[in-house]
Amino acid sequence: CEEPPTFEAMELIGKPKPYYEIGERVDYKCKKGYFYIPPLATHTICDRNHTWLPVSDDACYRETCPYIRDPLNGQAVPANGTYEFGYQMHFICNEGYYLIGEEILYCELKGSVAIWSGKPPICEKVLCTPPPKIKNGKHTFSEVEVFEYLDAVTYSCDPAPGPDPFSLIGESTIYCGDNSVWSRAAPECKVVKCRFPVVENGKQISGFGKKFYYKATVMFECDKGFYLDGSDTIVCDSNSTWDPPVPKCLKVLPPSSTKPPALSHSVSTSSTTKSPASSASGPRPTYKPPVSNYPGYPKPEEGILDSLD
C-alpha cells in the first residue's frame, strides 16, 4: 500500500513510509486538541487489494471549552451550536440592556486544553442621562436624573413674551434608546411666523388666519383669465418662509397669432374697464420687470395683468 490516509482529527503514530506490505498495520492517535472516545478503531491494515481498510477519525472529538451560562438579562449563543475549540460564542443582551465586555469570545487551544479567549460580558440596564434642556421650552420629568430604556419625555414651549407664540420645531417626544442615547435630537422652540401671502390677480381660498405660524397651510386660486404659476398650496416652514414659495397668477395669453403681442404697460381697451395690475412700476419702455425673490411675496409679471375680480 501507499501512504496511509490523513485525517483532520488524528495523526499517524510514527513516521509514514513510502510503501507498506500487505497485512502491515498502522496506528493513529488523536491530534492535539482532540480526545479519544472508544470504541471506534484508530488503526488500519494494508489489505491484499493494496488498499487500506476503512478507518475514520470519528473517535477523536474536539476539546470543548467550559460551559458558559447566559449572562443575566442576555443570552450566550454558541456559533454552530458547539463549544468546541475554533468556534465562537456570541453574546446578546435583552432589549433594554447593553453589553459591557466582548461581544464574541473564541474557544482557543492553550496547550491541550480548550479555553475561552476572555471573560464573558455582562448585560447592563440601558440608562440615559437627562435629555437636553432647550431654550424657550421645557420637558416632562425634569426632576428625574436617570432614565431607563424607553422612558419618554415630552417637550413643550414656554409662553412667548411677545404677541407671537413659540412653535415647537421637531418631534415633541423623545425616548431613551439603545446605547443609552436619546432617540433623536431635542426639538427647538422659536417664533415662526410667515408673512401675509399676497397673490396679485388671485386670492386665498383656504387656511385663513390672523397670522401664519409654523405649519400653517394656505391655498390659492387665480382670478378668471389668469393661471397659477407655482403650487396652489403653501406651508409655513421652520425658517418663517413659505414652502414652496407663494405662487403667482399670470395672465392667460390669447391664442398666438402670426405676430406675438407686444408687452406693454398701457391700459388695455375693452368694453369693460381693465387696467394693468402688475408689479411693474410707472410708464416705462416695454421690458420684463426685474423679478424679486423675497419669499412670500408676489413678483413682477410679464405684460399687462388685468384686474378681474
Epitope: K193, C194, R195, F196, V198, E200, N201, K203, Q204, F208, K210, K211, A277, S279, S281, S292, N293, Y294, G296, Y297, P298, K299, P300, S307, D309
Partner: antibody, heavy 118, light 107 residues
Framework: EVQLVESGGGLVQPGGSLRLSCAAS????????ISWIRQSPSRGLEWLGV???????NYNSAFMSRFTISRDDSKNTAYLQMNSLKTEDTAVYYC????????????WGQGTLVTVSS | AIQLTQSPSSLSASVGDRVTITCRAS??????LNWYLQKPGQSPQLLIY???SLHSGVPDRFSGSGSGTDFTLKISRVEAEDVGVYYC?????????FGQGTKVEIK
C-alpha cells in the same frame, strides 16, 4: 421704533409731476414694507401701492400707469413719484409701514397735502 | 376691486350708548377685515385687525365680529373721545380697499 415722515407735497398744476418722500428715522426704511395711502374728501381712503423689503412692488391698478413707488436705502427714504396729475389727485398722502408683514396699517404719519389745481 | 359699504354713513350717540357700525363686502373676504378710527384733525389709527383682534392700547369697549361679507364694529359704552370717522379695510385681495367711512358724533 421707526418713525416715517412724509414730505414733498404742495401745489401742482394738472398734468404736472410730483415726488413725495417718506423719510425713516429710528430704523432702516429697507427693513419695512412701506405702503402709500391717500385720503381726499371726495374719494375717501385709497391704497396706492406697496414696496416690500426686497424692493418688489404692488400697485392699485387704478394708479399704476401714473404712480411709481421706489426706495433709496442710502437716503433711508421711500418715494412716490406721481405723473400726469389730475385735479382728483388732490389729497393728503400718507406713507405707512405695513405691520410686521401683514396688511394692517398701525403706523400713520401726519401726511403731506398735495393740491392739483390750475 | 372689492367694494366695502359701511352703514350708517353717520350717527349721533350719547355718552354711554352702545354703538354699532356695519361693513359689507362685495364678495367674501373671510376674516380679513380691519377697523380704523380717524379722530378730528388726526391721522387714522388702527383699532381692530383680523375682524376681532384688538390692536395694542385700544380700549376693550371696542369689539369686532363677522365673517365672509358682513362685519360689525361695536362700542359697548361710547365715550366723548370716540368721536370721529370709522373705516373698515379688507386685505384678502389686491388692491386693499377701505369703506367710505361712518361718522360718529356725540349728542
Amino acid at each position: 421704533e421707526v418713525q416715517l415722515v412724509e414730505s414733498g407735497g404742495g401745489l401742482v398744476q394738472p398734468g404736472g409731476s410730483l415726488r413725495l418722500s417718506c423719510a425713516a428715522s429710528g430704523g432702516s426704511v429697507s427693513s419695512y414694507d412701506i405702503s402709500w395711502i391717500r385720503q381726499s374728501p371726495s374719494r375717501g381712503l385709497e391704497w396706492l401701492g406697496v414696496i416690500w423689503t426686497d424692493g418688489g412692488t404692488n400697485y392699485n391698478s387704478a394708479f399704476m400707469s401714473r404712480f411709481t413707488i421706489s426706495r433709496d436705502d442710502s437716503k433711508n427714504t421711500a418715494y412716490l413719484q406721481m405723473n400726469s396729475l389730475k385735479t382728483e389727485d388732490t389729497a393728503v398722502y400718507y406713507c405707512e409701514r405695513v405691520y410686521d408683514g401683514y396688511p394692517w396699517f398701525a403706523y400713520w404719519g401726519q401726511g403731506t397735502l398735495v393740491t392739483v389745481s390750475s | 376691486a372689492i367694494q366695502l359699504t359701511q352703514s350708517p354713513s353717520s350717527l349721533s350717540a350719547s355718552v354711554g350708548d352702545r354703538v354699532t357700525i356695519t361693513c359689507r363686502a362685495s364678495q367674501g373676504i373671510a376674516n380679513y377685515l380691519n377697523w380704523y378710527l380717524q379722530k378730528p384733525g388726526q391721522s387714522p389709527q388702527l383699532l381692530i385687525y383680523y375682524t376681532s383682534s384688538l390692536h395694542s392700547g385700544v380700549p376693550d369697549r371696542f369689539s369686532g365680529s363677522g365673517s365672509g361679507t358682513d362685519f360689525t364694529l361695536k362700542i359697548s359704552r361710547v365715550e366723548a373721545e370716540d368721536v370721529g370717522v370709522y373705516y373698515c379695510q379688507q386685505y384678502i385681495k389686491l388692491p386693499w380697499t377701505f369703506g367710505q367711512g361712518t361718522k360718529v358724533e356725540i349728542k
